[in-house]
């Protein structure tokens, strides 16, 4: 029986040109994590393998950095980076656990404008 749960950073926003950390955490299971895949829609961004380490997809090499931990850092964000991101934990013997993060990339001025109205 799969008892684990994935906690994620949930819905997040960042400004164009900036960077963001995508983070998932698997808890409440004794299962052993053997690999974590990071995907954007159906595109593989990166793999963190327990034995072989990190592999970043060639098309994302310039803008994706491994870590911290099992997380993923996206750099030089564009509006096109807006969308769903998934962390897929391959675990023995439970199976796969999937976490979802929605990232919204805002134009710099929109992000700044929004900041003015934040409650201190």
């Amino acid at each position: 029986m799969m008892t684990g749960t994935i906690e994620t950073t949930g819905n997040i926003s960042a400004e164009k040109g900036g960077s963001i950390i995508l983070q998932c955490h698997l808890s409440s299971t004794t299962a052993q994590v053997t690999q974590v895949n990071w995907e954007q829609q159906d595109q593989l961004l990166a793999i963190c393998n327990a034995d072989l380490g990190w592999h970043i997809s060639p098309s994302f090499k310039d803008r994706v950095a491994p870590g911290p931990g099992l997380g993923l850092t996206l750099q030089s964000l564009t509006v096109n980076d807006t969308g769903e991101y998934f962390c897929i934990y391959h675990t023995y013997p439970d199976g796969t656990y999937t976490g979802r993060i929605f990232l919204e990339v805002l134009e710099s001025s929109v992000a700044e404008h929004g900041a003015r109205f934040q409650i201190p």
Partner: antibody
Framework: QVQLVQSGSDLKKPGASVRVSCKAS????????MNWVRQAPGHGLEWMGW????????TYVQGFTGRFVFSLDTSVNTAYLQISSLKAEDTAVYFC???????????????WGQGTMVTVSS | DIQLTQSPTFLSASVGDRVTITCRAS??????LAWYQQNPGKAPKLLIY???TLQSGVPSRFSGSGSGTEFTLTISSLQPEDFVTYYC?????????FGQGTKVEIK
Amino acid sequence: QVQLVQSGSDLKKPGASVRVSCKASGYTFTSYPMNWVRQAPGHGLEWMGWINTNTGNPTYVQGFTGRFVFSLDTSVNTAYLQISSLKAEDTAVYFCARTGGHTYDSYAFDVWGQGTMVTVSS
Amino acid sequence: DIQLTQSPTFLSASVGDRVTITCRASQVISSSLAWYQQNPGKAPKLLIYAASTLQSGVPSRFSGSGSGTEFTLTISSLQPEDFVTYYCQHLHGYPCNFGQGTKVEIK
């Protein structure tokens, strides 16, 4: 090369304890789960459970709780099976086996120890 | 728990024969199934994983197929060293049970 080498066969009296060791070499020990499998004479393979080599957390199959303990010494890349209060029905070959494969659909016991025969007899 | 039933339990065949061993799961296990070969007094050896992927170094006369609840191991042309016991195992969550085994004997 990747291998698991187990301790030698052991003859014990009922009520005694035994410890079987499984030394791994040729790979990163803490990256692959380790399993224990029992095979009684003339019988099939029975999965006893496994130990998370990253956290040291053991999981036991029903029927292998209480008297059976899985442990690790990661400094020497070794997994251990301890059986206490031995009974005649514990007489069997005990295997350690690594879970290979990185993704859920490719898991399998890809490397096995040679087996340790434990005989319990008065 | 998911139970695996292998059939037949015993199989009599001759060198050169094509033989098939079946493994049925009590519930759907996708393709999370492995096949092992065991010689008497030896450790099992992985033949097939993910239902149909041949393990490195295993002769191509061995093949696996199936998904869901029904799986098969086929040996296309039996060799003298193939007259041993075969086990299936599911790896679809805990516990990772084995089938009861199929012993292939010389006719």
